[in-house]
């Protein structure tokens, strides 16, 4: 990681638990204010590798429900609605940070985890064609 | 949130602090061993709606680095590797947490932070508003 | 229980025409792709066509592609392969196949066959 | 198209023994890979999915495992109802195609 220079505003914390153990306020602060994910909703449903919203909801973790993607088909949508046998579906993964309770069904203590999610679909050629 | 139970073995934390600032371990625990999300890097290139990354730093941030996919085109790519018009390539995006310090500079100080990165791109039938 | 049922092999001569029928039952036809396979004597298994739900896509590989055609009555819940131009390396059993899909990747179900000698 | 190579193209051994039949594919496959089982005179019957996913009904002695060209079938305990045939099939690239076969007998 990148070394901060110590704020002297900044709370205390001895050496040997740093960076180990932090604490994080837990008020999200959204950045989003500008755009609206609501407007890429419709995606799903009109791509040409459309795909399914599925609810994974974890108790233990922070956030406790995330959406993951599943293409509902093998291969593309052409634009009669059938599929392309020459083109596939795949998902579009991505790792992102979550917070797991820590020891179990504590309140307020985390590790920090990270985990794949699959976030759309997208569709690609199977074959890359090798050039000599 | 869901009311969890204390556990006896947990950390304690005045309820006037919670759960507004909560203990995080930052040792990452990836639960990632099983797939390997090297294997999709090349769909960015074989996309019929490609995408190129782009880096966004920022060290008062965890995680600091973060990619963002930018559309190559506005339409898709055709099997002839022409693009077609028709149809547009969208950027697929996800609300992700991120760490904030804060305090700016604070090295075991942050809050919670929703951000909003585009993953990916996926080719779309655009909407057509029908005039009466 | 799902059942699929080839008929219409034989024997036929190179050059010659021959017409598959597979009758499906069981479950509800118009919902799954459908495959045609076939294994000659003694060998593997080798995709010969495929065709989608409602018949809107299909796929042939080179070795068959323009002498055989797969389609579907859905009405009938059957699936063809008209086969023309048969050649001796043709001579195969047939097998058609069931998708868990609407679109014909991997097969669930098959037939029990049926035997296409092309001989003189 | 893609080439699938399986080996060993047969194979004896013996009631409870571990049973491993491998299949490489000419080029990645991102787990779109099936394998079936064929008796003589029967039609194949489809055991695995995706590389790893046990179709309905199918024993848990059967498994499957790998990513990218390399796959691997296990039986993890042979019973003598197991002595068939057995083939792979990609299906990331048409035309979808099938490994040469391994044949299972029993010692």
């Known amino acids: 990681g990148i070394a901060i220079p110590r704020n002297s505003g900044c709370p205390n914390s001895e050496d040997k638990n740093f960076p180990r153990t932090v604490m994080v306020n837990l008020n999200i602060h959204n950045r989003n204010t500008s755009t609206n994910p609501k407007r890429s909703s419709d995606y799903y449903n009109r791509s040409t590798s459309p795909w399914n919203l599925h609810r994974n909801e974890d108790p233990e973790r922070y956030p406790s429900v995330i959406w993951e993607a599943k293409c509902r088909h093998l291969g593309c949508v052409k634009a009669d609605g059938n599929v392309d046998y020459h083109m596939n579906s795949v998902p579009i993964q991505q790792e992102i940070l979550v917070l797991r309770r820590e020891p179990r069904h504590c309140p307020n203590s985390f590790r920090l985890e990270k985990i794949l999610v699959s976030v759309g679909c997208t569709c690609v050629t199977p074959i890359v064609h090798h050039v000599a | 949130g869901i009311a969890i139970p204390r556990n006896s073995g947990c950390p304690n934390s005045e309820d006037k602090n919670f759960p507004r600032t909560v203990m995080v371990n930052l040792n990452i625990h990836n639960r990632n061993t099983s797939t390997n999300p090297k294997r999709s890097s090349d769909y960015y290139n074989r996309s019929t709606s490609p995408w190129n990354l782009h880096r966004n730093e920022d060290p008062e941030r965890y995680p600091s680095v973060i990619w963002e996919a930018k559309c190559r085109h506005l339409g898709c790519v055709k099997a002839d590797g022409n693009v077609d018009y028709h149809m547009n390539s969208v950027p697929i995006q996800q609300e992700i947490l991120v760490l904030r310090r804060e305090p700016r500079h604070c090295p075991n100080s942050f809050r919670l932070e929703k951000i909003l990165v585009s993953v990916g791109c996926t080719c779309v039938t655009p909407i057509v508003h029908h005039v009466a | 229980e799902v059942q699929l049922v080839e008929s219409g092999g034989g024997l036929v001569q190179p050059g010659g025409s021959l017409r598959l029928s597979c009758a499906a039952s069981g479950f509800t036809f118009s919902t799954y792709g459908m495959s045609w396979v076939r294994q000659a004597p003694g060998k593997g298994l080798e995709l010969v066509s495929i065709?989608?739900?409602?018949?809107?896509?299909?796929f042939y590989p080179d070795s068959v592609k323009g002498r055989f055609t797969i389609s579907r009555d859905n009405s009938k819940n059957t699936l063809y392969l008209q086969m023309n131009s048969l050649r001796a390396e043709d001579t195969a059993v047939y097998y058609c196949?069931?998708?868990?899909?609407?679109?014909?990747?991997?097969?669930?179900?098959w037939g029990q066959g049926t035997l296409v000698t092309v001989s003189s | 198209d893609i080439q699938m190579t399986q080996s060993p193209s047969s194979l004896s051994a013996s009631v409870g023994d571990r049973v491993t039949i491998t299949c490489q594919a000419s080029?990645?496959?991102?787990?779109?890979l099936a394998w079936y089982q064929q008796k003589p005179g029967k039609a194949p019957k489809l055991l695995i999915s995706g590389a790893t996913s046990l179709e309905t009904g199918v024993p848990s002695r059967f498994s499957g495992s790998g990513s990218g060209k390399d796959y691997t079938f296990t039986i993890s305990s042979l019973q003598p109802e197991d002595i068939a045939t057995y083939y792979c099939q990609q299906y990331w690239s048409v035309p979808w195609t099938f490994g040469g076969g391994t044949k299972v007998e029993i010692k």
């Open positions: 080029e990645d496959i991102y787990d779109r």
């Open positions: 196949a069931r998708d868990p899909r609407h679109d014909g990747y991997f097969f669930d179900y």
């Open positions: 065709i989608n739900h409602n018949g809107g896509s299909t």
